[in-house]
Interface confidence: low
């Protein structure tokens, strides 16, 4: 048995006569043979669930669910209750109604076995019938909403009449009807004004019924109509077995370049028309088991269950349903030498499903793990300016498909053929497994005999020690020009275009800093700034070369404070700035300030 509502509302007036009917509560059956019996909790409660007093005023008919006044609530009783309400004015009191037999204790009141009946308390006598507005004659102040379990026997779940009004104003005629779409499963009996379901409901067909209750009031020659929403929600039970959308029970996957732990290799989707069990219980009661295969597979893969509520069409309306995504995930990094093909099976069990049929599905994942070979092109040819500054990025080396790699740790090394001309260094980028070539020794770069540099690039997989090699030929171009005196170590210090382009700085491939002109659109990623190379700085990312020295690109790498209009980078640097941003790396500070519009004019005049 269960209540069709979790809360009921009625009005109580001082000195209302004993024997006044107040309202009906209704229970619906879970099984045809059940017979409801109602009992009231012992106490009246007030504001913030304060226990006010033993209930000596209101009784219930155990078989019908009719609540009525057993004795009049007079002024002295009302004052007694008010005193106990923690000093708050006594506006609302409530009672708990239980379905018998029930295991619920007085302290607990949870739907479906308990409902609360709230009484709005008026410290006046019942108003004259002629003064009541049609809305007050027809419906309670708080609009009711109903909950009906699917697949349960039909039954009565509401009674329209406001019983105190009917009892005290017998000369006012009130009629009710339900406005409903064609063929909906509800009926309002014209004599008793009871609303009942005509047949058992199916939530998977329709979950919400937004009906409209129409009340017509006749008082003498006056006729008025009042309409209120009458919403019914159908509650779910686990009566649908899990299925495969479009019959897809097998997913095939190839593991090649993405070999990192936690990589999702393949996903299969299971559809369940139900939305139970609820999310807190779901993973415990909707189980997935990777069936035993070989030990390697058990160690290498795991299955992750990702349930999501969705909505599907049923008879022109949306109903909620659940899609369960089962992801086959790598449990560990896979070595590049691994080479296997296998079929994995996952057993999915909707343990609450009672049938007919089975609540069990078998998911199949066909997985091929391919080995990865390391290849480099036979030769790289690059050029570098003799004016390049230390940490200038001059190019990249990358094993075949390195940008697609994850979970593969490749380290690059340079072996120089001429010891005195070892100008370049290489660092491995964690982002795309490439090697970034940069100027490491500017003195060697300026030696006249170091016009052509020869290196061997060696790429090594750290896990298997497999290697690939390539020739690197670097041509040194141009002639060295000493920098003007007074130039800062970092390009980022310069705040104006002219001083920026006159100087070099750490990381500059040409020996000159570059000015990036912003778009001037408020706080923007494209702020104006001075950079060693606008190709790499700022780009919102502190790369592996820039981490070598804070002077290279503080716009991307600074962990200090940023003054002025900006959005900080994640985890460091300036993501977006206002106007022009310049930085003082030693002081660990950057400033973003509006563009100085007189700047070009001033520079021209000051020449």
């Amino acid at each position: 048995l269960y209540f069709s509502r979790d809360a009921y509302w009625e009005k109580l007036y001082v000195d209302q006569a004993a024997g006044t009917p107040l309202l009906y509560v209704h229970a619906l059956r879970d099984a045809p043979e059940e017979v409801p019996s109602f009992r009231l909790g012992q106490h009246l409660y007030g504001t913030y669930r304060t226990r006010l007093h033993e209930n000596n005023w209101i009784c219930i008919q155990e078989d019908t669910g009719l609540l009525y006044l057993n004795r009049s609530l007079d002024h002295s009783s009302w004052e007694k209750l008010s005193v106990r309400n923690r000093g708050f004015p006594l506006l609302t009191v409530y009672l708990k109604v239980f379905l018998s037999p029930t295991s619920l204790r007085e302290g607990e009141c949870q739907w479906p076995g308990c409902a609360r009946v709230y009484f709005s308390f008026f410290n006046t006598s019942f108003p004259a019938c002629s003064s009541l507005k049609p809305r007050e004659l027809c419906f309670p102040e708080t609009r009711p909403s109903f909950r009906i379990r699917e697949n349960r026997p039909p039954g009565t779940f509401h009674q329209f009449r406001l019983l105190p009004v009917q009892f005290l104003c017998p000369n006012i005629s009130v009629a009710y009807r339900l406005l409903e779409g064609e063929g909906l499963p509800f009926r309002c009996a014209p004599d008793s004004l009871e609303v009942s379901t005509r047949w058992a409901l199916d939530r998977e067909q329709r979950e919400k019924y937004e009906l409209v209750a129409v009340c017509t009031v006749h008082a003498g020659a006056r006729e008025e109509v009042v309409m209120v929403p009458f919403p019914v929600t159908v509650y779910d039970e686990d009566d649908s077995a899990p299925t495969f959308p479009a019959g897809v029970d097998t997913a095939s996957a190839v593991v090649e370049f993405k070999r990192k732990e936690d990589t999702v290799v393949a996903t299969l989707r299971v559809f369940d028309a139900d939305v139970v069990p609820a999310s807190g219980e779901l993973v415990r009661r909707y189980t997935s088991t990777l069936l035993p295969g070989d030990t390697w597979a058990q160690q290498t893969f795991r299955v992750e269950h990702w349930p999501n509520e969705t909505s599907v069409q049923a008879n022109g309306s949306f109903v909620r349903a659940t899609v369960h995504d089962y992801r086959l995930v790598l449990n560990r990094n896979l070595s590049i030498s691994e080479n296997r093909t296998m079929q994995l099976a996952v057993l999915v069990n909707d343990s609450d499903f009672q049938g007919p049929g089975a609540g069990v599905l078998l998911l199949h994942f066909n997985v091929s793990v391919l080995p990865v070979s390391l290849h480099l092109p036979s030769t790289y040819s690059l050029s570098v300016s003799r004016r390049a500054r230390r940490f200038a990025q001059i190019g990249k080396v990358c094993v075949e498909n390195c940008q697609a790699f994850s979970g593969i740790n490749v380290q690059y090394k340079l072996h120089s053929s001429g010891a005195n001309c070892s100008t370049l260094g290489v660092v491995t980028s964690a982002e795309d497994t490439s090697g970034i070539l940069f100027v490491n020794d500017t003195k060697a770069l300026r030696r006249p005999k170091c016009a052509e540099l020869h290196y061997m690039v060696v790429a090594t997989d750290q896990q298997t020690s497999r290697q690939a090699q390539a020739q690197l030929l670097v041509t040194v171009e141009g002639s060295y020009v000493a920098e003007e005196a007074g130039c800062p170590l970092s390009c980022a210090v310069s705040k104006r275009r002219l001083e920026c382009e006159e100087c070099g700085g750490l990381g500059s491939p040409t020996g000159r800093c570059e000015w990036r002109q912003g778009d001037g659109k408020g706080i923007t990623r494209n702020f104006s700034t001075c950079s060693p190379s606008t190709k790499t700085c700022p780009d919102g990312h502190c790369d592996v070369v820039e981490t070598q020295d804070i002077n290279i690109c503080p716009q991307d790498c600074l962990r200090g404070s940023i003054v002025g209009g900006h959005e900080p980078g994640e985890p460091r640097g300036i993501k977006a700035g206002y106007g022009t941003c310049n930085c003082f790396p030693e002081e660990e500070k950057c400033f973003c300030e509006p563009e100085d519009i007189q700047d070009p004019l001033c520079d021209e005049l000051c020449r």
């Epitope: 779409g181 937004e210 479009a246 069409q313 022109g316 949306f318």
Partner: antibody, heavy 120, light 107 residues
């Protein structure tokens, strides 16, 4: 018989707003999901937005998210599309369409369309 | 998002010809596919739903087939009133997407 009649189209300026309406008749409007679909001049069909039978489910395509709002008033049998921050790319004929009760997201009845032109 | 690719973009045919239009989805969509016909200046009209089911009132010369990613609309004997643009649409997941259309013109 089922009828869907759109209105509210016309010339809108970039950055401004328009509100389209679609009045339904000949069927129980509150029992059906409804959609807006648009068609740029000389181009194909593009789905814009969906709303559930009771207004509880809304979904807009990414290109209009945050700018367009679909809503309905079941008491007036009317579907709406509030279009804010209009751009030239929103120039199109806008159709309202009813979902099929049999197959869900199939459009079994369409309005005649209303033309929205965004131009300064 | 699921991309729908229709081919050919246009074709010329004569009355009585058998005409085939194909539609390919970028991922498997089961049978969640619909076909529409649109004539100039008019709203589209549903022909086929669920890949192969004929909408009530649509002539039987129209038929649909396919499942997964590849689908076909066939007009067994082209009639004068069939010269129009045809669109496929997936209803497997939101955002709902249409094919680019196939224009059937008189040869």
């Amino acid at each position: 018989q089922v009828q869907l009649v759109e209105s509210g189209g016309g010339v809108g300026q970039p950055g401004r707003s328009l509100r389209l309406s679609c009045v339904a008749s000949g069927f129980t409007f509150r029992n059906y999901g409804m959609h807006w679909v648009r068609q740029a001049p000389g181009k194909g069909l593009d789905w814009v937005a969906i709303i559930g039978y009771d207004g509880s489910k809304e979904y807009n395509v990414d290109s209009v998210k945050g700018r367009f709002t679909i809503s309905r008033d079941n008491s007036k049998n009317t579907l709406y599309l509030q279009m804010n921050s209009l751009g030239a790319e929103d120039t199109a004929i806008y159709y309202c369409a009813r979902e099929s009760p049999i197959t869900g997201t199939t459009f079994d009845y369409w309005g005649q369309g209303t033309l929205v032109t965004v131009s300064s | 998002d699921i991309q729908m690719t229709q081919s050919p973009p246009s074709l010329s045919a004569s009355v009585g010809d058998r005409v085939t239009i194909t539609c390919r989805a970028s991922q498997s969509i089961g049978n969640y596919l619909n076909w529409y016909q649109q004539k100039p200046g008019k709203a589209p009209k549903i022909l086929i739903y669920a890949a192969s089911r004929l909408q009530s009132g649509v002539p039987s010369r129209f038929s649909g087939s396919g499942s997964g990613t590849d689908f076909t609309l066939t007009i067994s004997s082209l009639q004068p009133e069939d010269f129009a643009t045809y669109y496929c649409q997936q209803s497997y997941s939101t955002p709902l997407t249409f094919g680019g259309g196939t224009k059937v013109e008189i040869k």
